[in-house]
């Protein structure tokens, strides 16, 4: 009686179970009663990443430099090429089809997490006692200067965008 289901890594064709081609190979011809499934390795710049019965391999992804992309990991016959973004850019999506510049944290905000090739800068507001007076994709909020440790007094309080201004102890108001 012909089978209705096949084992893992097999497929049903013409009422018989044939072996699937292993990753990195494509199907040339189905098995018969007398012959095994015929498979061929994928060509240069092609891949198949699963046990399959595909007659064509997939093309490796092209990391287009015009879109700010570069190769992070070269593809093999079993894996696709992985693209990432050039320095200062990050992917616009999980599949990384194009790149955009990293966001800068505005004055009053500091970098909580520096951007990577796949994630944008995360900014956070500077709390009281800290400031940032620059627009930057790298700088964290900096602590206000401690006038006391310099034997000085605060002449002007700091803000989230400015440091404290220190002055001499004997300053007359």
């Amino acid at each position: 009686e012909p089978p209705t289901a096949c084992r893992e890594k097999q497929y049903l064709i013409n009422s018989q179970c044939c072996s699937l081609c292993q990753p990195g190979q494509k199907l040339v011809s189905d098995c018969t009663e007398f012959t095994e499934t015929e498979c061929l390795p994928c060509g240069e710049s092609e891949f198949l990443d699963t046990w399959n019965r595909e007659t064509r391999c997939h093309q490796h992804k092209y990391c287009d430099p015009n879109l700010g992309l570069r190769v992070q990991q070269k593809g093999t016959s079993e894996t696709d090429t992985i693209c990432t973004c050039e320095e200062g850019l990050h992917c616009t999506s999980e599949s990384c089809e194009s790149c955009v510049p990293h966001r800068s944290c505005l004055p009053g905000f500091g970098v909580k997490q520096i951007a990577t090739g796949v994630s944008d800068t995360i900014c956070e507001p500077c709390p009281v006692g800290f400031f940032s007076n620059v627009s930057s994709a790298f700088e964290k909020c900096r602590p206000w200067t401690s006038c006391e440790t310099k034997d000085l007094v605060v002449q002007q309080a700091g803000t989230n965008k400015t440091d404290v201004v220190c002055g001499p102890q004997d300053r007359q108001r």
Partner: antibody
Framework: QVQLVQSGAEVKKPGSSVKVSCKAS????????IEWIRQAPGQGLEWMGS????????NYAQKFQGRVTITADTSTSTAYMELSSLRSEDTAVYYC???????????????WGQGTLVTVSS | DIQMTQSPSSVSASVGDRVTITCRAS????????????LAWYQQKPGKAPKLLIY???SLQSGVPSRFSGSGSGTDFTLTISSLQPEDFATYYC?????????FGQGTKVEIK
Amino acid sequence: QVQLVQSGAEVKKPGSSVKVSCKASGYTFSTSWIEWIRQAPGQGLEWMGSILPGSGSTNYAQKFQGRVTITADTSTSTAYMELSSLRSEDTAVYYCARGDDGSYVRWYFDHWGQGTLVTVSS
Amino acid sequence: DIQMTQSPSSVSASVGDRVTITCRASQSLNFSVNQKNYLAWYQQKPGKAPKLLIYWASSLQSGVPSRFSGSGSGTDFTLTISSLQPEDFATYYCQHYYSYPWTFGQGTKVEIK
């Protein structure tokens, strides 16, 4: 020990001004922020503004900007909060409290004055 | 401005009960540089000034009984009274001090059941 002693209760007419004082002792007055907070009858706490007495630097809540003036006299270790153009909704207990002491790590209010009741009524 | 929302607005409890009050901030009060949460809790009794209980979200102010504790991080915070005492019937406020203007929660009144 740290103490903040406020001036006595006031009754004011609408449109007038009130000036509440807060005399500090037991710590370095000039280097610690003085905060002003008010509480209308049966209501919650509302921050109005603050001053760093040694520098005269101030911060004000937007709601009170232009109507409140916070000052300090370091020679007498006294802070003042003046509220102008009074209306009935300004009837409240006004508190002063000590904020950060220059260490930049103590922004919470660890000592409070006893409060000053200001009643605005025609 | 950072909004602070407390719940519940009132709670009826008996002496010995465990009481939990929550406070939610409209933005994170946690700062990555020092990993501190800029939040304080105060207790206020009728006709009295507020009293500091907890600062940095979980540090107990000197002289405050250990039955009071604070927890939470980011936007969600809790004040817990492990075993309510007669003197604990009061109104409790959370307050952030992350950035100006400082704001308070609307308060939670702990009443006798």
